[in-house]
Each structure stands twice: as C-alpha cells, then as structure tokens.
Interface confidence: medium
C-alpha cells in the first residue's frame, strides 16, 4: 500500500534535436562498474544508476544530472532538463512540487500554510485546501449554564460563550479562561486554569490516495493552539471497490486488501507490514466515511540515512450515509462555523 502520492508528473515536449546537435551517451553496455560501490556522504542515497548498471551516490538538489547520474528519489527530486535545450542531456536536480491551490483568487504553493482570516488556519495539499478552526471556544458548560449565548467580543477575533445566569455559576467550575483560547493575541504565558482542548481531525484532504488531516490542540506547555497533522488514505485510487460489494448489498462499508504490505513514503518503507482498512463505496448516492478510527505511529526506514515516523489515520470502521454530499469535502466540517463563507468564497 503506497502512502506516497503519485508525484505530479512534470512533462514537457522537448524540441526536436537539430541535426547538428549530438546528444552524449551516458550509458555504456555492457555495464562497467567499479569493483566496490562508492561511499556516499551522510544523508546521500546509494542507488542504482539510471542505466540500471552500477551503484552511485544520488545527485542532490541543484546538482547536475543525466540519464545515468540520477537525482535522489528518496528526497523527492527529479531531473529538470528544461535549461538544456535543445539537447535535453544534462539537467539540474529539482524538487518534485505538488499542485498548488487557488483560494479567493490567491495562489498558494503545495504545502503552504496560511490564514485567510483570524479564525482559520489553512494548508494547501496537492491542489486541495484544508482548514482548521483557530477559534477553539469550548462548548458551553452544560452543568451550570442554562442560557448560554455565543457572542462577538469587540476587538477580539473569536466569539465567546457568555452565560446569562452567571450568578448561579458554582465556584469549582470557574476553570475557563477564554484568554487561553483567543487566537488574536500572541500571549505566551502559561495559564494555570488552562482547559485542555483538542479539535476533531479535519476530513482527509483527498477522497482516495494519500491525503493529510489536521487538528488543533493546546495540549502543550504554553497552552497555545498548535496544528498537528497525520497522513490519511480513505481508499485506494486504483481499486474498483464496487466489484467487492456482496450480492444483494448496495454498499461495502469497509474494504480490506487480502495481502499485508508495507507502507511507502518518499522511497522509505515502513518497518512492519500492515493490512489497512479503507472506506468502501455504495452503488446508490450514499457515501462512506470513517466512523471508528485511531491514529497510529508508523516507523519508516530509508534505504540510506535515518528513518522517521509519521502519524497515520487507521480506519477501524466506516459508515455509509446520505448526509455527506461530497464524501470528503474539506470544508464539510466548517459549514457550521459562522464565517464559513469567508473561506469558501
């Protein structure tokens, strides 16, 4: 199961070679390789060259590259030949960049985080914008508050709960200091009466294949809202799950491949195999979304250099219903917020 998204294919049509232009041959057959493979600097991958012959140290960002001396695939690099017209023989290693996003006429690069206003933090992930609310006003404390109201406070970005029957508020529940949640002021002190808050995870940014999901949590030393992220893969793009729906049924809520496989991410491989569960599909107009899930930590080992771990959504169960107009509309969870229009325009 590849967690890695297919990199945006960077294609260009080379101009026809002029007859006077000779293109150098970088590969020789039969292969001629040194007796022992080279020792690569720390963090540089030892890979098979583009001729499928010898072990070489992968070219790094900004290095020259050829069909033989290829760029480090584990760092998401590709050989950009655009500067070597018309031969297209020697290129420069460049970063594979995902598709950017456009929101309200503003272009954002892949991976860029931005705040369209003081209430939301958004991230562009491969053509999709995912947003999480920064206004973390907790639910009104139901135990004592009989008439809660959500009001705008002059000079503050986020609405806050006020309780009209404040006089009846018992002493022991006076924990809430809304200053700890106000996203408008950059207050860096720790509040003793900080209430731990973690928002729900945002919907996965893609309906199939690798996506990203984010949430806000103030469970940190500063009691300050910070964004956490995890990888998510709701369903594979290359499997027709409808074929797996049992006879007489309209939906398959959960699809699980037969074989356990390793997750791969940027050329690195998970240290153990997994048999992930995916949300299924329906033959009617219902959609299937995660219902029971958890976040697991997946350890990756890279061919060369250090490994790393990533938080990954693990789907336990899904349900199929009519309410999700678009199974993973990145804005689906935001529609209940008063300023949704400010983002979605």
């Amino acid at each position: 199961t590849a967690l890695s998204p297919t990199p945006t294919t960077m294609t260009f049509t080379p101009a026809p070679l002029e007859e006077t232009t000779t293109r150098p041959e970088f590969c020789k057959w039969p292969c001629e390789c040194p007796q022992s493979p080279p020792r690569c600097p720390l963090g540089v991958s030892l890979i098979t060259d583009g001729c499928e012959c010898c072990k070489i140290c992968a070219q790094q960002l900004g290095d020259n590259c050829t069909e033989a001396a290829i760029c480090d695939p584990h760092r998401g690099l590709y050989c950009d030949y655009s500067g070597d017209r018309p031969r297209y023989a020697i290129g420069v290693c460049a970063q594979v960049v995902g598709v950017g996003c456009v929101l309200d006429g503003v272009r954002y690069t892949n991976g860029e985080s931005f705040q369209p206003n003081c209430r939301y933090n958004c991230t562009c992930i491969d053509g999709t914008v995912g947003c999480t609310p920064l206004c973390l006003s907790p639910r009104p404390p139901r135990l004592w508050c009989r008439q809660p109201r959500h009001v705008r406070v002059p000079g503050q970005c986020c609405e806050q709960w006020v309780c009209d029957d404040d006089a009846r508020r018992p002493r022991q529940t006076a924990l809430l200091d809304t200053r700890a949640f106000a996203a408008s002021g950059a207050v860096e002190q720790r509040y003793e009466n900080c209430i731990a808050y973690t928002s729900p995870w945002s919907p996965c940014s893609t309906t199939c294949g690798l996506g990203i999901s984010t949430r806000i949590s103030n469970v940190n030393a500063r009691c300050w809202p910070e964004q956490e992220s995890r990888l998510c893969n709701l369903r594979p793009c290359d499997v027709d799950i409808q074929l797996h729906i049992k006879a007489g049924k309209k939906c398959l809520a959960v699809y699980q491949p037969e074989e356990a496989t390793n997750f791969t991410l940027a050329g690195c491989v998970s240290t153990r195999t997994y048999r992930p569960k995916y949300c299924g599909v329906c033959t009617d107009n219902r959609c299937c979304i995660p219902y029971k899930s958890k976040t697991i930590s997946v350890d990756f080992q890279c061919p060369e250099g250090p490994g790393f771990s990533r938080q990954v959504l693990w789907i336990n169960a899904c349900f199929c219903n009519l309410s999700c107009r678009n199974p993973n509309d990145i804005f689906a969870d935001l529609e209940s917020y008063p300023d949704f229009e400010e983002i979605a325009n």
Partner: antibody, heavy 121, light 107 residues
Framework: EVQLLESGAEVKKPGASVKVSCRVP????????MHWVRQAPGKGLEWMGG????????IYAQKFQGRVTMTEDTSTDTAYMELSSLRSEDTAVYYC??????????????WGQGTMVTVSS | DIVMTQSPSSLSASVGDRVTITCRAS??????LAWYQQKPGKAPELLIY???SLQSGVPSRFSGSESGTDFTLTISSLQPEDVASYYC?????????FGQGTKLEIK
C-alpha cells in the same frame, strides 16, 4: 492497555428493562468495535449484538431483535446495552467486549468484568 | 447462522499432559476463529485469534491450528492455572457464534 468498566449488578422484575453501561477509561470508544455477550448461570457464551464494520452499523442477534438496543456516547466513552421485556431466562452475566480493529472482523481482545442481571418476581 | 461444534464438552488431564480441544464450523469461516479462556467467576480472555495467532501475553504452551473448517486448540504441557472453560468463536459472519465450551479439569 484498554479496560472496560461495567456498571453494577441489577435486580429487575419480569417485564421491566435494564440498561447496562460499559465505560472505556482513558481510551477513545471511537477506536473500538463494541459487542455485548451474555452468559446464563452454568451456561456458555452467547453473542447478543455489536458493531458490524462490514455493514457499518450495529447489528443484533435474531433472538434479541426488537428487545435490545445498543448505543454509544462518545462524549463520555461509554457504551450501553438496554434489554427490555425482561423474563426470568434473561438472568445472566452481561459482558461488553471490544475488538481493536486491525482486521475488518476482529476477535474480542478486551472484555468488561461483567454485570450480573437477575430477573425475579 | 454458523454453528460451532466444540468437543469434548469436558475433559480431565494431568499436569504436564498435552491437551487438545477441537472446534468445527458448519461452513467456511476462513481463519476468523478465536479461542477464549474463562476461569471460574471471571470474564473470558482472548488466547488465540485468526485461527493460530497467539494473543500477546498468553503463554507459548497455547497454540492454535486450522484445517479447513476444523480448528484445534492445543496446550502442550498442562499447568494447574489452566483449569478453566475454553470457548471457540467464529467472527467471520454475524451472528458471531461461540462453541458450547469445554470444561478442563486437573486429574
């Protein structure tokens, strides 16, 4: 380590209802598929119902259909099993059991301590 | 419903003996079979899942095997603390049915 904590023993009259709770302290109920199993005195285990991930809904054994309701309150991480129209043969220990979810269908790797329900006039 | 037929219903063996309990499914359940141990007055505990996988923390003297629709729980060397009732369960198709149980005693 996941723990399931069930409510205390109940004594009910025939025709009444009983609601047994099962709390998951320090863990999220949304990560678990919850099931209920009962065991009459000196008898074997009997599956009553639980969450079926393949269909994406809670399903009940035919025997209990219409009499049992299983619900979950994710805000308190508590599962409930309510059995109505009680009769003497419903006297049993009621267990909540959970599966952790690595497979679509999973064995019950965590069990509550059991709640004794006695139905007697 | 899938019927799980477990045998024997009770057995008595000596400490150190090799003990086997069998379970037969009335139809194909693939490897979706679990074995549980229930000590008197306690809740059941998972021993084996997926037919032959040992649940973490369970002593290695317990093992499971499968052959078609026949499943076997083996205790390689019986210990006094193994006195309990043992149940098989299929969890492939709802309703998830249990075998009638095997009561194991020490001679």
């Amino acid at each position: 380590e996941v723990q399931l904590l069930e409510s205390g023993a109940e004594v009910k009259k025939p025709g009444a209802s009983v609601k047994v709770s099962c709390r998951v302290p320090g863990y999220s109920l949304s990560e678990l598929s919850m099931h209920w199993v009962r065991q009459a005195p000196g008898k074997g285990l009997e599956w009553m119902g639980g969450f079926d991930p393949e269909d994406g809904e809670t399903i009940y054994a035919q025997k209990f259909q219409g009499r049992v309701t299983m619900t979950e309150d994710t805000s308190t991480d508590t599962a409930y099993m309510e059995l109505s129209s009680l009769r003497s043969e419903d006297t049993a220990v009621y267990y909540c059991a959970a599966s952790g979810g690595w497979e679509v269908h999973d064995a019950f790797d965590t069990w509550g301590q059991g709640t004794m329900v006695t139905v007697s006039s | 419903d899938i019927v799980m037929t477990q045998s024997p219903s009770s057995l008595s063996a000596s400490v150190g003996d090799r003990v086997t309990i069998t379970c037969r499914a009335s139809q194909d359940i693939s490897y979706y079979l679990a074995w549980y141990q229930q000590k008197p007055g306690k809740a059941p505990e998972l021993l084996i899942y997926a037919g032959s996988s040992l649940q973490s923390g369970v002593p290695s003297r317990f093992s499971g095997s499968e052959s078609g629709t026949d499943f076997t729980l083996t205790i390689s060397s019986l210990q006094p603390e193994d006195v309990a009732s043992y149940y098989c369960q299929q969890y492939k198709t709802a309703p998830y049915t249990f075998g009638q149980g095997t009561k194991l005693e020490i001679k």
